[in-house]
Structure formats: C-alpha cells, structure tokens
C-alpha cells in the first residue's frame, strides 16, 4: 500500500492551526488509518486541539489547532491492511514562534526628570534585533547620550523631558526569516505642578463690604487640580456660598465681605499624578478706626483738673489726636517728652496720655475758655474717625467792653457790657450807686442779649457824661466793670504827604489825623483851587476807602495849571480843622489814559472773580470804554469784553477749577489805548457740590 501525507512537511507559527491529509493508494479494503504523535502515542479521534478525522477508506486528516511549541516533532500516519500489513508515512511538523510583542503597553507614563525605561518585551523563536525609533529616526543615531537601549532591549531615557514626549516605535527584526514587526508606544511625560501666588501678602480692609481675590498660578501636566486651605483647614465651596467663590479652575479664591476673621494664612495646593506643590498667601485685614467711647464732662473754673477720654478700635492700632474748634492740641509743640505716651503742652495746661487704644486729655487749672467742643480723631493708614465731646465749665461772670465811650450832646450812644458767664448771669447798671433806669435818668434805656447788655444813653447835658457801672451775678459769683462816657471832639487835621499830578487828575497822599476826637472818622473833604482863583472846589471821600491806601484823587483839573489842595476830616461831632494847603502843577495833555489799577475779589463759589477797575488819569479826554481779555494760563484767550466807561468792575464767571488765570485791561479814550493793566489769580479746587453760575458781567 502506498501512503502519502500532504503536505509532506509542515511549519506552523505558534498559535496558528494547520491540517495534514494522509492518503492511501491501493485496493486493499478494510484498511485502518491511524495517526501517532511525536512521542509515539496514538492520537484518538474527536480531540479538540489535535484532532484526527477519518474521511473515508482511503484518507484521514490530522488538524493541529492553535499550535504550541510542544506540538513539534514527527507525526506518523500508519495504515494497516486486513492482512495485518502496515504502511506508514511521516511528516516533520516544525513549530516556530513568530516575532510578537508580549509586554509593550501603550501609553507609558513617566514623571519629568526621572530616568524613564520604555518597556518592550518581544517573543520569537530566533533572537531578534530590536531598533527603537522616534519621529522616524533610530534614537541611537540621535547621538543624545540620554538615550540608551538596555541589554533587555528596553529603551532608557535619562532625565526625561517634556519635549521627549511622543510616539516611540519598538521594531524587531529576524534576518534569517526576513521577519519584521513593530509596536508604536505612546510616551507621556507628566510634569509635577509648580505653583506661585500672585502676591504673597494681600492687604484688605474690613467692614467695607468689599471682596478680596487671592490668586495662584499653577502649571504642570496633566493640568493640576487646585484646592485651598485656611489656617490648615480645607475650604469647601457650598452652593450659594455667602463667603467663598472659586473660579472655574479654582486658581482664584474670592472672599466676600471681608472682615477681621478672614485674616489668616491661605495655602493654595496644586496636584496632579506627578506630584503636588503649594504656595502660601498671608491675608492681612486692616480695619478703619472706630471711636468706641467718649464722655462729656462738667467742671468748675479753677478746679484742679478734668480728664476727657477717647477709646478707639482699628487695625493697625489707631493713633488718637485731640483738637478743639480753634486749637490743634496734638500738633502743637510739646514740652519735655517723658515717655512717648505722655505729651504736655508748652504752657503745661494740657496733658495727653495715650496707651494702646485709649487716649485721655487732662486739662489743669481749668479756665472758662476751656469750655466747648473737644474732638478726638483716631487715625490709621486705612482711615479715620472723629467724635466730639463737650466740656462744660461753670464760672463767675467776666465782663468786658470799651471802657471809654465817646459821644456828644444829643447823640445817642450804646455802652456795651459784654458778659461771659455760666450759668448765665443777671446784669444791672448803676450810676452813682443808683440802679438804672430810674426816674432821674429818663434819657437811658437798657437792652439785654444772652452775651451782652447795652446801656443806651442820649446825653442832653454835661451831667450825663461820667461813670456808669455794669454788674453781673450768677450762682458762682459776681463781677463789676466801670465805664466812662466821654465828651467827643472833632478830629485834628490830616497832613498831606505828597501830590502826584497828571494832566486832568491828581492823587493826594495823606496821613490820617493824629486825633480822631474819640469817634470814628466818617469822611474826608478835599478842597482845591487854581492859584489865583478865589473859590475852592470840594469833594467828599468815604473814610474807609480813602484810608485803605491813604490816597484821594481829585478830578476835572486843567492841564499845566498850578493848584492848591487841602484836606479836612469829618467825624460824628463835626468837621475838624483843615490842613495847610499844598501846591502842585498838573502835567500837559498826555493823550492816552493811564492803565486802570486792578484788584480781584474771589467769589464765594470759588470759580468766579470780581475784578475791580480803579480808574486812573484819563489823559485829558474822557474814557470811552475798557477792554478786557482773559484766559487760563497756557489755554486759549476768551473773547474780548468791552465795558462802558462808568464800569468799576468786571465779573468773570464759570472759570475752570484750580486754574491760574491772567486778565488784561486797557482804558481807551479818543486819543488811544492805555498800556495794559495785568492781574493774575488762581481759582479754588473743585468742591463736591457745585454752585450754579453764569457768564461774565460788568458793573
């Protein structure tokens, strides 16, 4: 019998399957076809992995499923005829391991900076050659000493960097078989977090309803998650959190309605699979000062001492200063400084003691003038708070007023007795020990106000002049003051210093009378005439205006003419003696007028000004008008303002705040313009409430 196995030899890769057909040629019937394994065992039919199937009288199939290395060897097909004769055929089955990757996971993750070993385990019947590639190139050809292929064919990258990240190919080759296989491994480089606080110290102010945001900037791969602690305790954000808000990535922590309790050490923590890092932020919460205690006090004059106390809270601890409406006690020069917490005024009258949050002001040897409002101000770098307290001083009456009062017969006058007393005093007037008013003195009336008593006297004879007594009494004591009513006289004569003549006017400079007669000078009278004339021309001048510069101007003079001028002063009693005459000669006609003199009066609103025009010499012909130009310095000129000749001022309104302005004015007559008069002024800083105002006007 002829026995053949097809195929005659077999190569199977591990894990693969293959079948072999055993064929018998010849006529013998009832043949038995059997298969034997390499170890000589007869293979039974219907096995699962190595299966023998009898096809028909002349063939049988051996199938090796999912081959493994142990299945290798010579398989025998034996055919036994009915006569017992045996024929056989053999097939040499070779099992080989194909190049495969047993352990080459992807991705493989490493921490930046560590020595990374990329795992790639290869199985193969023959020892393979392993090449590692990155971006298509053999890593060894990179000439980067950090890349080493280890003896086990793993790739080591020393001190792996983020830039080393990417796809690495583990490629195996078996030259004998021309076999090649590769595995692409994704290498991920994880970077531990780095975190930095934008500000290590954050300042905030309490109780202003403000929010403060703490910010940390973190980097790393994978993106770090952020968390926060306050003084070591985790901060969790609840829904509708009234206190904390986190940004989407938790890099920002907003603390709402900052108060003193929020002052703490906050730590922001960044974490990823490569590690964690934290940063610290110190939140310093400052508080505006608040005065927490003041108390009013009452004292008696000449009492030894009284102490006013002021307590305040705040952070930083506030310093406390004291002032009154008229005196800044804390900024005054102090006497010896025994300790910083005790300061004494130079007069020794007040001592300020400060300790932590409390300050006291002690007043020694109390005077009635110490009464009133005392303001303590607590200040720190954040702000300040002030509060008033009141010191009440009880004292016996004190009287004052002009002791000598001048008048004349028939001229009503007030003798003023000013009274300072607490509690308030009752006031009485006496003449020669007799209480006023009385039937003997019908020409006397008394008027009282809270601060003074007025004795109104209309003297009708010599007898009414003389002494009057004012007496005030309260429960602390009493005080009297003697007044004298004196017969007034007319003033002595003013003296002419010099005369400055122009063509049609002259300025007479004078000294006030040595004796006013006891009552104020009301007016001055100037008299002048051309030499050779008999009639004196005269003019009255208001004393207040004339006395300010000590000048009166006489007008309507003829050019190149010699004049005599003299002055007298008028008071309530009458016109005083006239001065000696002083001669001067007017100048020839000049033509143009002299520039006016300018004086400014700032408006109460702070951004308007009244510029007074004081007319000087008209140059011999009447002034037609004044021309005014003005501007904020370094800004544009405003349109020219033309004022009628009678104007004595111009109002400039709606000016810029806190700006320097210049004003020029010329007087113009028929002959031409004067030189320009110039005036510079500054407006006030802008107030919070702005008064309404208009545009320039003249008067």
């Amino acid at each position: 019998l002829q026995v053949d196995i097809v195929p005659s030899q077999g190569e199977i890769s591990v894990g693969e399957s293959k079948f072999f057909l055993c064929q018998v040629a010849g006529d013998a019937k009832d043949k038995d076809i059997s298969w034997f394994s390499p170890n000589g065992e007869k293979l039974t039919p219907n096995q699962q992995r190595i299966s023998v199937v009898w096809n028909d009288d002349s063939s049988s199939t051996l199938t090796i499923y999912n081959a493994n290395i142990d299945d290798a060897g010579i398989y025998k097909c034996v055919v036994t005829g009915e006569d017992g004769s045996e024929s056989e055929a053999t097939v040499n089955v070779k099992i080989f391991q194909k190049l495969m990757f047993k352990n080459a996971p992807t991705p493989q993750e490493f921490r930046e900076g560590e020595d990374a070993v990329i795992v790639c385990d290869v199985v193969s019947s023959l020892p393979p050659t392993i090449i590692w590639k990155h971006k298509g190139r053999d890593v060894i050809l990179k000439k980067d000493v950090r890349f080493i292929v280890l003896s086990n064919n793993y790739l080591q990258i020393r001190g792996i960097k983020k830039t080393d990240e990417g796809t690495y190919r583990c490629e195996g080759r078996i030259l004998a078989r021309g076999e090649i296989n590769f595995k692409d491994i994704q290498v991920i480089v994880n970077v531990p977090p780095t975190i930095q606080a934008r500000q290590n110290i954050v300042n905030a102010t309490a109780n202003l309803g403000q929010s403060v945001t703490l910010v940390c900037d973190a980097e790393g791969f994978p993106e770090p998650t952020m968390s926060w602690t306050k003084d070591g305790e985790q901060i969790e954000q609840e829904e509708d959190d009234e206190k904390y808000i986190f940004s989407d990535d938790s890099s920002q922590l907003t603390i709402k309605k900052v108060d003193k309790n929020d002052e703490a050490e906050y730590i922001c923590i960044a974490e990823n699979k490569a590690g964690e890092q934290d940063a610290t932020i110190h939140l310093k919460v400052f508080a505006k000062p608040k005065i927490t205690y003041v108390e009013n006090q009452t004292a008696m004059e000449l009492e030894e001492q009284v102490t006013l106390t002021c307590e305040a809270s705040g952070d930083p601890i506030p310093s406390i200063t004291w002032r009154t409406s008229t005196r800044n006690i804390s900024s005054e020069e102090k006497a010896s400084w025994t300790r910083p917490e005790k300061q004494e005024t130079l007069d020794g009258h007040m001592v300020v003691r400060s300790h932590a949050r409390v300050s006291s002001l002690t007043l020694k040897s109390i005077q009635y003038t110490d009464a009133g409002e005392y303001i303590c101000t607590a200040s720190n770098t954040i702000g300040q708070d002030s509060q008033s307290m009141y010191l009440e001083v009880q004292y016996a009456p004190k009287l004052q007023g002009p002791v000598a009062v001048y008048t004349w017969e028939g001229n009503q006058v007030n003798i003023t007795c000013e009274v300072f007393a607490y509690p308030s005093a009752t006031i009485s007037w006496f003449r020669d020990g007799q209480l006023l008013p009385s039937s003997n003195y019908s020409n006397i009336k008394i008027y009282n106000t809270p601060s003074a008593s007025y004795l109104e006297v209309t003297p009708d004879s010599e007898n009414d002049f003389g002494n009057y007594n004012c007496t005030a009494v309260n429960r602390i004591g009493q005080e009297s003051l003697e007044f004298i009513l004196v017969q007034a006289d007319t003033p002595s004569s003013p003296s002419i210093d010099q005369v400055e003549p122009y063509s049609s006017t002259a300025q007479v400079q004078f000294d006030e009378p040595e004796a006013t007669g006891g009552v104020p000078i009301l007016k001055y009278k100037a008299e002048w005439r051309a030499v050779g004339e008999e009639v004196w021309h005269s003019k009255w001048y208001d004393a207040k205006e004339a006395s300010m510069e000590g000048i009166v101007t006489i007008v309507g003079l003829k050019p190149e003419t010699t004049y005599a001028v003299r002055l007298a002063a008028l008071n309530g009693k009458g016109l005083g003696e006239i001065s000696a005459a002083s001669e001067f000669k007017t100048q020839p006609v000049q033509g143009e007028p002299s520039a006016p003199k300018l004086e400014g009066q700032m408006g109460e609103d702070g951004n308007s000004i009244k510029v007074n025009l004081i007319k000087q010499d008209d140059g011999g012909s009447p002034i037609r008008h004044y021309l005014v130009r003005y501007r904020a310095l370094s800004s544009e000129w405003k349109p020219e303002i033309r004022l009628p000749s009678g104007s004595d001022h111009v109002m400039l309104k709606s000016l810029d705040w806190n700006a320097e302005y210049e004003v020029y004015v010329v007087a113009e007559n028929q002959q031409g313009k004067s030189k320009a008069a110039h005036f510079v002024f500054r407006t006030s800083a802008q107030p919070t409430a702005i008064p309404a105002n208009g545009s320039p006007t003249s008067g």
């Epitope: 310095l633 000129w637 020219e640 010329v666």
Partner: antibody, heavy 124, light 107 residues
Framework: QVQLQQSGPGLVKPSQTLSLTCAIS??????????WNWIRQSPSRGLEWLGR?????????DYAVSVKSRITINPDTSKNQFSLQLNSVTPEDTAVYYC??????????????WGQGTMVTVSS | EIVMTQSPGTLSLSPGERATLSCRAS???????LAWYQQKPGLAPRLLIY???LRATDIPDRFSGSGSGTAFTLTISRLEPEDFAVYYC????????FGQGTKVEIK
Amino acid sequence: QVQLQQSGPGLVKPSQTLSLTCAISGDSVSSNSAAWNWIRQSPSRGLEWLGRTYYRSKWYNDYAVSVKSRITINPDTSKNQFSLQLNSVTPEDTAVYYCARENIAAWTWAFDIWGQGTMVTVSS
Amino acid sequence: EIVMTQSPGTLSLSPGERATLSCRASQSVSSSYLAWYQQKPGLAPRLLIYDTSLRATDIPDRFSGSGSGTAFTLTISRLEPEDFAVYYCQQYGSSPTFGQGTKVEIK
C-alpha cells in the same frame, strides 16, 4: 525801538539738537505783557508756530502739539534773551526759524516784532 | 488745532487795482484774535492788521481788514508796486496757526 537778534548754527546733523538764541533789546524778557515766540517756515509746512515763553509772576511755556515732546524754550533774564532747543532733529526740521514778540502791552497781541530769521539745514 | 485756509493761492493784478484776499477758519475765531501779515522774499513777515481790522503802526490806510466767525477778508484798495508780496492770515486766540498764504503778483 524793540529789536530781536537771532544767533545759532545753520547746519545740524540728524538726531542731534538744534539750538538758537534770540537777544531782545528795547523790551524785557520778564515783561508781564509780552510773550516770546519761536516760529519756523518751510516750503512743505508754511509758517508754523513752535512755542512761547512768558513771565506772569512765574515762568510759563506753551508748545505746539507737533513738537511738544522735543522742544524746550528757556528765558535768560541775565542776558535778556530766550533760546530754542529742538531735540532729535530730522531733515523734516529744515526751515527758516524766526523769533517773535507777542505784544500785549500795546493791545496788539499778534507778532509785532520779528527776528531776522535763521536758515537751519538738517543734513549729515 | 484751528486750521486757516486762504484763497486764492495766487492773485494776479495790476498796480492801482483792488485786491481782496480771503481767509477761512475751521472753527469760529474771535475777531479780537485775527491778524494779517505781509512777507517779501528773504524777509521776516511784517504785521499789517490785528484784531481783524486794526492797522499796525506805520501801515498805510489802503490796507483794511474785516470779517467775523470763520470768514475774514484783507482788502488792499489800490495796489502800489511795493504791495506785491505773499500775505498770511493768523489766529492767535488759541495755539497760533497761520494760513498757507496768498501770493499777490503783478499781472
């Protein structure tokens, strides 16, 4: 009568500083009713005001926006003159430079007195 | 800044004729602050008119100025040979600016 006499170099290199002086006779640089100006004239820009200095209880300067960052005008009371300095010049600054008085005292206000002019060329 | 525009650029006239030069401002100029200057080749400009209509010292009365708001005019009633020159208008209410000039030439 009032006269203005200019002096200074006619050639300046690019990026350097142009410096001119204007001496006043017959008036005072410290007058509170005058202002002392520099003006230039070139074919491309015509007459162009550059700036002024004036005294109004203190010294003030006004400058044209086009040169504000480069110009300085200084008075010299001891010599009764004023000067122009123009920094970082370019050929664009080539022009005839004039000094002139703004007369407020006489209510003229415009430029009533001019210097003789200085031709300044900016070239390397 | 206020831009001053003069027209015409050139005016060709004969001696004895009347010359009318125009100057327009890009925004309103107070008449107190407008001037006219005359410039001859190689010389500095010379002030002719200030405050729109007032003649400067020694300026003959054939020169007159008028206008208000944004439109101003310089008139030379009878041109003399010495009047042929370039004329500039200028505003000096804010930062001073000049017109580009009108050349008056002999026809």
